[in-house]
Interface confidence: low
């Protein structure tokens, strides 16, 4: 039988005694920045080219003996996980190794930077097909390492990195915290986050997805036919590098944004036991375990969206938090969330020629998050329509008035503290779904987009208050682009999208001792693109 | 994921521009920043990545590195340029005393300086 980790990432249609998905990444080159490797191991012989790049610090300690098997252990295993003959994910991928970690598995930021520069220069000298760079290492937050990753990603390279094994917020580490990098946490055979001694996988909003990372069978550097089991977020990242190689081999023109969206889309959803994560990190951590797509073609018709959380704003009264989409993604909606419930909403605003999502803290609040819904929508023309606070008691409303523009998201922002505490609820008049509605003291922002074949509809789900959580999901074939709460209760902590479900969270009324009139209503905007569907059918 | 103004320790040395007897001083009021790893045991003081502003050419990087060496020598400090970056980021890697940071931050074209730090296999 195949190892558990390969079975886990394989969609059911490929599951057989043999793990043999089509096209094993043969058009893709994977660079590995790690320890030295045993290139004559039968798992990777002829598949990994050892470059002459080496930049490592001296080993610590006077009595350290350089045993080749120890020096090569980490890198050899990872090369095997990516492209090994028997236990590899992308059996057709070719690899190149750079030595940036010494025999103790230690390197430097500067050595890693020089390694990344080496890859960029190699790419310029001899352009090949798609490139994947695997960085199975982590250090403290580094502005310069993140900047270098950003530059390499913008040159068309896909970077995959380990989230880190510190049982901590991945945003505190680099390159895990670089937005352009695909950051991978580790799960085990039971879909539990991996525990490593007293520590374990990192988590949080800087993690893109998880992958198998415990008890992973791969090439051992003790002999050329030996196998060993290793664990860590490096092993998880190696799985994703392999999956990325497979996807890029099938569709070499995929951009980084498209690849990331596909990785997220084809992941197993909501299988991780979140209780392992600290409570305040659960909502920020993606509940996704990487998997290969069920078919190498035909994903193009899908409207892909993902949720991007900002950093925490901090508690100051004027504090704001900003969530940004990747350069070739569209911001289709913007929401906010505060654990204390003290927030002043959110708005979409232009920054450097691109829309960003900004959330506003309120006085006495512990801080807010901005949540951006970032989508792949080719040839989109999106704009934000704003209605200032209304004078009338009817509430504020705004709709998409331009011909051919559809509503993809609603945001509201207010200046008064604790909006809604003394205000009557405002309900949307029926039969007018293509508009955003809010309190009379709030500014309302509608995201309006025009794109070929784009159609959207509004779905609502209201439950009488008090209610801690209300959800509404989009049906099969539709993608959630907007998620917000209808005004009508002062207890709403915020709204955010989890996969294709809109979640509206309210205060735990049992602890606040207060009750609320009306209902807590989650409003989802669900969209699809007939144009993308037609285009993909023509390809078939 | 994390923005560039994210959760990491930042020591900002706000320095008034001084020509130090040389041309090409930075514009008045601009400041370069110094960054180091928030995790103390992982710091590697004595080696610094000097990152220059985005459009800086390789020749300007080399000239800035030489200028740092010359100014340091005038103050009796030895420095070693370990690598000049180009292709991804403009800048250079220098081995020098931390005493020279203030001087280095005043050099023309400097965007920020980061102290080297350790990374680990995961």
């Amino acid at each position: 039988s195949i190892p558990w980790n390969l079975e886990r990432i394989t969609p059911p249609r490929y599951r057989a005694d043999e793990y043999q998905p089509p096209d094993g990444g043969s058009l893709v080159e994977v660079y590995l920045l790690d320890t030295s490797i045993q290139s004559d191991h039968r798992e990777i012989e002829g598949r990994v080219m050892v470059t002459d790049f080496e930049n490592v610090p001296e080993e610590d300690g006077t009595r350290f003996h350089r045993q080749a098997s120890k020096c090569d252990s980490h890198g050899t295993h990872l090369a095997g996980v990516v492209s090994g003959r028997d236990a590899g994910v992308a059996k057709g991928a070719s690899m190149r190794s750079l030595r940036v970690l010494n025999c103790q598995g230690k390197g430097t930021v500067s050595g890693t930077l020089i390694g990344l520069e080496f890859i960029r220069k190699s790419q310029l000298v001899q352009p090949v097909g798609p490139l994947v760079v695997l960085l199975p290492l982590a250090g403290g937050y580094s502005r310069v390492l993140n900047a270098a990753c950003q530059r390499l990603a913008r040159a068309g390279v896909v970077l995959v990195t380990a989230a880190g094994n510190f049982r901590d917020d991945a945003c505190l580490y680099s390159p895990a915290s670089a937005p352009e990098v695909i950051t991978v946490g580790a799960t085990n055979a039971q879909d539990q986050p991996v525990t490593l001694g007293t520590l374990g996988t990192n988590f949080g909003r800087c993690v893109d997805l998880f992958a198998p990372g415990e008890d992973i069978i791969g090439a051992s550097s003790y002999c050329s036919t030996c196998f060993v089991s290793q664990s860590g977020t490096s092993q998880a990242a190696a799985h994703v590098a392999g999956i990325a190689a497979m996807m890029l081999s099938a569709e070499p023109e995929l951009t980084l944004a498209e690849l990331r969206q596909r990785l997220i889309h084809f992941s197993a959803k909501d299988v991780i036991n979140e209780a392992w994560f600290p409570e305040d990190q659960r909502v920020l951590t993606p509940n996704l375990v990487a998997a290969l797509p069920p078919s190498t073609h035909g994903a193009g018709w899908q409207l892909f969206c993902r949720t991007v959380w900002s950093a925490h704003s901090g508690p100051t009264r004027m504090a704001t938090a900003v969530a940004r989409c990747a350069p070739d993604e569209e911001l289709l909606s913007c929401s906010s969330f505060s654990r204390s419930g003290k927030r002043r909403g959110e708005r979409m605003e232009a920054q450097g020629g691109k829309l960003v999502c900004r959330a506003h803290n309120a006085f006495g609040g512990e801080g807010v998050y901005a949540i951006a819904r970032c989508c792949l929508l080719p040839q989109a023309n999106c704009s934000v329509h704003t209605a200032p606070p209304a004078e009338a008691s009817m509430g504020t409303r705004v709709h998409c008035h331009q011909q051919g523009h559809v509503l993809t998201g609603c945001s509201s922002h207010w200046e008064v503290e604790d909006l809604g505490t003394h205000k009557p609820p405002v309900l949307r008049p029926r039969g007018q779904p293509n508009q955003c509605v809010g309190h009379r003291e709030a500014s309302i922002h509608a995201s309006c987009c025009h794109a070929p074949g784009l159609e959207c509809k509004v779905k609502e789900h209201g439950i009488p208050a008090p209610q801690e959580q209300v959800t509404v999901a989009c049906e099969e074939g539709w993608t959630l682009t907007g998620c917000s709460a209808l005004p009508g209760t002062s207890h709403v902590l915020g709204a955010y999208a989890v996969d294709n479900t809109c979640v509206v969270r309210s205060r735990d009324v049992s602890t606040t001792g207060s009750t609320s009139e009306g209902a807590v209503t989650a409003v989802a905007i669900c969209c699809r693109s007939r144009h993308l569907a037609q285009a993909s059918q023509e390809l078939q | 994921q994390e923005d560039e103004d994210g959760d990491y320790e930042e020591l900002v040395l706000a320095l008034r521009s001084e020509e130090d007897g040389l041309a090409e001083a930075p514009e008045h009021g601009t400041t370069a920043t110094f960054h180091r790893c928030a995790k103390d045991p992982w710091r590697l003081p004595g080696t610094y990545v000097v990152v220059l502003k985005e459009e800086t050419h390789l020749s300007q990087s080399e000239r800035t590195a030489r200028r740092l060496q010359a100014q340091a020598a005038r103050r009796g400090y030895l420095t070693k340029i370990l690598h000049v970056f180009h292709g991804l980021l403009p800048g250079f890697l220098v081995k020098m005393s931390g005493d020279l940071l203030e001087l280095a931050l005043k050099l023309p074209h400097v965007d920020y300086i980061e102290e080297d730090s350790s990374v680990f296999a995961q």
């Epitope: 925490h312 901090g314 508690p315 100051t316 009264r317 004027m318 006085f363 801080g367 200046e415 008064v416 503290e417 604790d418 505490t421 | -």
Partner: antibody, heavy 121, light 112 residues
């Protein structure tokens, strides 16, 4: 200069209500929260609550929640604190104090001169 | 509620003495993001309103003499008067603003 001038001393019977005013001058009234703090004879300081004059938002200490009302009249830059159902335990000097509504400036930099409220039958 | 405990509740000292008053909170007042301790010290003389001396545990309010200094972090804080002056005899209060606002019970500083 910046000043908070409070209304004069009051003598009230148990069960009655008292309304103390605090007139601000020398600064922009809307930019600062107004807190109320009381001090019983020979005792320490006890925080009662605050009002944000710009929005009218209030937050009261648990002990006073049911019987205190804080209001503000922006047009005359005056904050008010009304305490109902008075008992002899409410005999105290009542202070208003301002706090800048920005960042972490969560301290009281200017205080009123105090208003003595005596509750006696 | 956060409880603030000051000690001593009273002390006698002479002009020129160095005096230390301590304040303990029942939970940390350090905001991990801003690295600021939300603690202030106030001075109150008989029949007068309190006066702000120190905020953020160690920042002196403008106009406050530099003989007054604040220190500490987390749950333990100290107000130090390096050389007592006649006008310093008063009652001193610490106050937390980490979660709403609570004052310590006060320390009365008297002339020996």
């Amino acid at each position: 200069q910046v000043q908070l001038v409070q209304s004069g001393a009051e003598v009230k019977k148990p069960g009655a209500s008292v309304k103390v005013s605090c007139k601000a001058s020398g600064y922009t009234f809307n930019d600062y929260w107004m807190h109320w703090v009381r001090q019983a004879p020979g005792q320490g300081l006890e925080w009662m609550g605050y009002i944000n004059p710009s929005s009218g938002f209030t937050k009261y200490h648990q002990n006073f929640k049911d019987r205190v009302t804080m209001t503000a009249d922006k047009s005359i830059s005056t904050a008010y604190m009304e305490l109902s159902r008075l008992t002899s335990d409410d005999t105290a000097v009542y202070y208003c104090a301002r706090q800048y509504d920005y960042d972490e400036d969560w301290y009281f930099d200017v205080w009123g001169q105090g208003t003595t409220v005596t509750v006696s039958s | 509620d956060i409880v603030m405990s000051q000690s001593p509740s009273s002390l006698s000292a002479s002009v020129g003495d160095r005096v230390t008053i301590t304040c303990k909170s029942s939970q940390s007042l350090l905001n991990s993001r801003t690295r600021k301790n939300f603690l202030a010290w106030y001075q109150q003389k008989p029949g007068k309103s309190p006066k702000l001396l120190i905020y953020w545990a160690s920042t002196r309010e403008s106009g406050v003499p530099d003989r007054f200094s604040g220190s500490g972090s987390g749950t333990d804080f100290t107000l130090t008067i390096s050389s007592l002056q006649p006008e310093d005899f008063a009652t001193y209060y610490c106050k937390q603003s980490f979660n709403l606002f609570t004052f310590g019970q006060g320390t009365k500083l008297e002339i020996k």
